[in-house]
Amino acid sequence: AILGRSETQECLFFNANWEKDRTNQTGVEPCYGDKDKRRHCFATWKNISGSIEIVKQGCWLDDINCYDRTDCVEKKDSPEVYFCCCEGNMCNEKFSYFPEMEVTQPTSNPVTPKPPYYN
């Protein structure tokens, strides 16, 4: 293992469609991949009128957008389906939405809001 990198070997698994897909609804998914590839966890969810509906959680594979992310945070502004990925065992147990605002000239000292966490 490379120093400073969190190895992902398992992720929280969740499938909202479990009855139709005939899988377990929730569990722990072992992540597999080539030795030279990085493994990640992900979460994807919807915000229906302020109510969080988890769609899927599980393993994700070698994606540069997930490198070195210890927390699962969606940064896109108001996506239709929220998605985040991270590195580290079960790092997708908690996930958050923290949109990156367009950079404009601040009139005062900017304040970084604390992201809402879901689990």
Partner: antibody
Framework: QVQLVQSGAEVKKPGSSVKVSCKAS????????ISWVRQAPGQGLEWMGG????????NYAQKFQGRVTITADESTSTAYMELSSLRSEDTAVYYC?????????????WGQGTMVTVSS | EIVMTQSPSSLSASVGDTVTITCRAS??????LAWYQQKPGKAPRLLIY???PLSSGVPSRFSGSGSGTHFTLTISSLQPEDFATYFC?????????FGPGTKLEIK
């Protein structure tokens, strides 16, 4: 070496059944998602269903519901696909495939395919 | 059922060219979009999963992009071995469905 080795070609009569086997090696079979995909001659690809051996229950495409049975034998790392009430339109190459993840990220390891011909 | 469409259904190009194949979904498969290459008499090969990451051993001249319902596969600097049929597939909701394919031929 990660691979899926399928049983040989079959010629079947309409109304009969066929059972195709798929022997896995080089990966954790019992905790991997194994799917079946078919391709009629000169046609596109069609997902039939799949299962994760440790979960036991298979997930089938509605089109094949009631005609297809997907099973797995963990002791021999072998998956099976049985299709019944065969008709000429079932003539196709049948592939068993390993998925990257339980949430169906991509079909990364394919068997060599089994040609099933349905003819009277 | 999510219906996948691909365009063009076929195209001719020369070695060294850059080509783009488009895949559209009737409903958004989010990131659950994969691309496959198939040569005659062979099983398909996974090129791209999750809309953009490259599968193991796939050359970097292949790239995928898109989200929602619109996705593209781009092959830059075409090589002789790239002439084949390409399929997209959504695996967001069952039944998982494939596009009809795009046949890439040598001009």
């Amino acid at each position: 070496q990660v691979q899926l080795v399928q049983s040989g070609a079959e010629v079947k009569k309409p109304g009969s059944s066929v059972k195709v086997s798929c022997k896995a090696s080089g990966f954790q079979f019992r905790t991997s998602l194994i799917s079946w995909v078919r391709q009629a001659p000169g046609q596109g690809l069609e997902w039939m269903g799949g299962l994760i051996p440790i979960f036991g229950t298979a997930n089938y495409a509605q089109k094949f519901q009631g005609r297809v049975t997907i099973t797995a034998d963990e002791s021999t790392s072998t998956a099976y696909m049985e299709l019944s009430s065969l008709r000429s339109e079932d003539t196709a190459v049948y592939y068993c495939v390993k998925d990257l993840t339980w949430t169906n990220l991509g079909l990364d390891i394919w068997g060599q395919g089994t040609m099933v011909t349905v003819s009277s | 059922e999510i219906v996948m469409t691909q365009s063009p259904s076929s195209l001719s190009a020369s070695v060294g060219d850059t080509v783009t194949i488009t895949c559209r979904a009737s409903q958004g498969p989010s990131r659950w979009l994969a691309w496959y290459q198939q040569k005659p008499g062979k099983a398909p090969r996974l090129l791209i999963y999750g809309a953009s990451p490259l599968s193991s051993g796939v050359p970097s001249r292949f790239s995928g992009s898109g989200s929602g319902t619109h996705f593209t596969l781009t092959i830059s600097s075409l090589q002789p071995e790239d002439f084949a049929t390409y399929f997209c597939q959504q695996s967001y909701s069952t039944p998982f469905t494939f596009g009809p394919g795009t046949k890439l031929e040598i001009k």
